[in-house]
């Protein structure tokens, strides 16, 4: 039961995370005009990965797409790529994990197959989360660099008669959404990997062959060097799972502390 819960929770957490990554990627507020220590401008600028917007004090908002591909900074292209890779991997991971869910029966799918699929989706979620966190962090670093450069410009070269309003950009809402979403996807992926351990047999399972000895039965397991010796009247052939010593309910899930960036 604990494995199913861990797997289900991992799926839900990853689903929320990937939805967040998609939302962050589509959001326009990756960088927003820094209002601190600035004159009260009647326009508010903010930018996303795909377009830049201006919200006028009058309430009207105008957005313009980045219609050029070659003219865009390489860093922005890299961030776009990271976010898209994150979304694609996450989407594939979700698709795989749906079929891997223990609560969903698909034909006569073996537990080992489900375990492999759970692990695959878990790894995909982890990579997806890392891509999102990396993308957002690269963009944030770009903002910090530009912020301090424009701050330096504000206090130098003001010798001329005409002053210009230096528009500085700071972290937008999309960055925080991206960081949290990436973190959730990562956590979901880790949970899927943990669930996989509970689903998977530790060794390849074969039908055990029972040899009847007088007084006790010894079941030999070909391929393994373990034998289960049972005293009692049960002399029927039985499937022996190495992981059978643990029931689903007995699988322990250890609470872990996750720090959000």
């Amino acid at each position: 039961m604990a494995v199913t819960a861990c797997q289900g929770l991992g799926f839900v957490v990853s689903l929320i995370g990937i939805a967040g990554i998609i939302a962050a990627t589509c959001m326009d507020q990756w960088s927003t005009q820094d209002l601190y220590n600035n004159p009260v401008t009647a326009v508010f600028n903010y930018q996303g990965l795909w377009r830049s917007c201006v919200r006028e004090s009058s309430g009207f908002t105008e957005c313009r797409g980045y219609f050029t591909l070659l003219g865009l900074p390489a860093m922005l292209q890299a961030v776009r790529a990271l976010m898209i890779v994150g979304i694609v991997l996450g989407a594939i991971g979700l698709l795989v994990s749906i079929f891997a869910l223990k609560c969903i029966r698909i034909g006569s799918m073996e537990d080992s197959a489900k375990a492999n699929m759970t692990l695959t989706s878990g790894i995909m979620f982890i990579v997806s989360g890392l891509c999102a966190i990396a993308g957002v962090s690269v963009f944030a670093n770009m903002l910090v660099t530009n912020f301090w450069m424009s701050t330096a410009n504000m206090y130098t070269g003001m010798g001329g008669m005409v002053q210009t309003v230096q528009t500085r950009y700071t972290f937008g809402a999309a960055l925080f959404v991206g960081w949290v979403a990436g973190g959730l996807t990562l956590i979901g992926g880790v949970m899927m990997c943990i669930a996989c351990r509970g689903l998977a047999p530790e060794e390849t399972n074969y039908k055990a062959v029972s040899y009847h000895a007088s007084g006790h039965s010894v079941a030999y397991k070909p391929g393994g060097f373990k034998a289960s010796t049972g005293f009692g009247s049960n002399t029927k052939n039985k499937k022996i799972y190495d992981g059978g010593a643990r029931t689903e309910d007995e699988v322990q899930s250890y609470p872990s502390k996750h720090d959000y960036v």
Partner: antibody
Framework: DVQLVESGGGLVQPGGSRKLSCAAS????????MHWVRQAPEKGLEWVAY????????YYTDTVKGRFTISRDNPKNTLFLQMTSLRSEDTAMYFC???????????WGQGTLVTVSA | DIVMTQSPSSLTVTAGEKVSMSCKSS????????????LTWYQQRPGQPPKLLIY???TRESGVPDRFTGSGSGTDFTLTISSVQAEDLAVYYC?????????FGAGTKLELK
């Protein structure tokens, strides 16, 4: 058709108070930011105050800060300017104007004259 | 505060003539976000409230005759009337719409000979 009608002007003694109103019609008042602009006799235009569609933010010109209060009643489609501690230099024609694209003022009222004199 | 300087303070022209008036701001009114300058031109005929002519320095308001043209960017702006008509007799104001307080220029009075 967009219409803005100011009222409440008149003769006021220095140090006195006055409340101006601007009745709006012909547009969704609650969706637009509004301004008060004044014009002293034979002088140029001077921006006085701004209130956004949702009543926040609000901005004032330095000369009226702390003395004038701009407010609005969206259900009643009315803009207000409460003026206190009036001075002779506040004598002017007061116009209300609607905020538009480019932060421009596309529709203006006919104005209401406020005269501050002893 | 941004200071708006208009010149000349008055212009005397004959009907049909082309006329230009200038407006300079003490700070740039150009917004990099949308590549637009936040300067507006108004016309105020005697005894009337101001009327919007041009916003974003060069965008003509609907219903405004095409003889009115706005140009310029940053700090230097110009309003041009290609062929002055009798009804153009008015005071023309430029306004900073970029930084509060939204200051106006002192105006350019257009008079007919």
């Amino acid at each position: 058709d967009v219409q803005l009608v100011e009222s409440g002007g008149g003769l006021v003694q220095p140090g006195g108070s006055r409340k101006l109103s601007c009745a709006a019609s012909g547009f969704t008042f609650s969706s637009f930011g509004m301004h008060w602009v004044r014009q002293a006799p034979e002088k140029g235009l001077e921006w006085v105050a701004y209130i956004s569609s949702g009543s926040s933010p609000i901005y004032y010109t330095d000369t009226v800060k702390g003395r004038f209060t701009i407010s609005r009643d969206n259900p009643k489609n009315t803009l207000f300017l409460q003026m206190t501690s009036l001075r002779s230099e506040d004598t002017a024609m007061y116009f209300c104007a609607r905020f538009y694209y480019g932060n421009s003022f596309d529709h203006w009222g006919q104005g209401t004259l406020v005269t501050v004199s002893a | 505060d941004i200071v708006m300087t208009q010149s000349p303070s008055s212009l005397t022209v004959t009907a049909g003539e082309k006329v230009s008036m200038s407006c300079k701001s003490s700070q740039s009114l150009f917004n990099r976000g949308n590549q637009k300058s936040y300067l507006t031109w108004y016309q105020q005929r005697p005894g009337q409230p101001p009327k919007l002519l041009i916003y974003w320095a060069s965008t003509r308001e609907s219903g405004v005759p095409d003889r009115f043209t706005g140009s310029g960017s940053g700090t230097d702006f110009t309003l041009t009337i290609s062929s002055v008509q009798a009804e153009d007799l008015a005071v023309y104001y430029c306004q900073n719409n970029y930084i509060y307080p939204l200051t106006f220029g002192a105006g350019t009075k257009l008079e007919l000979k």
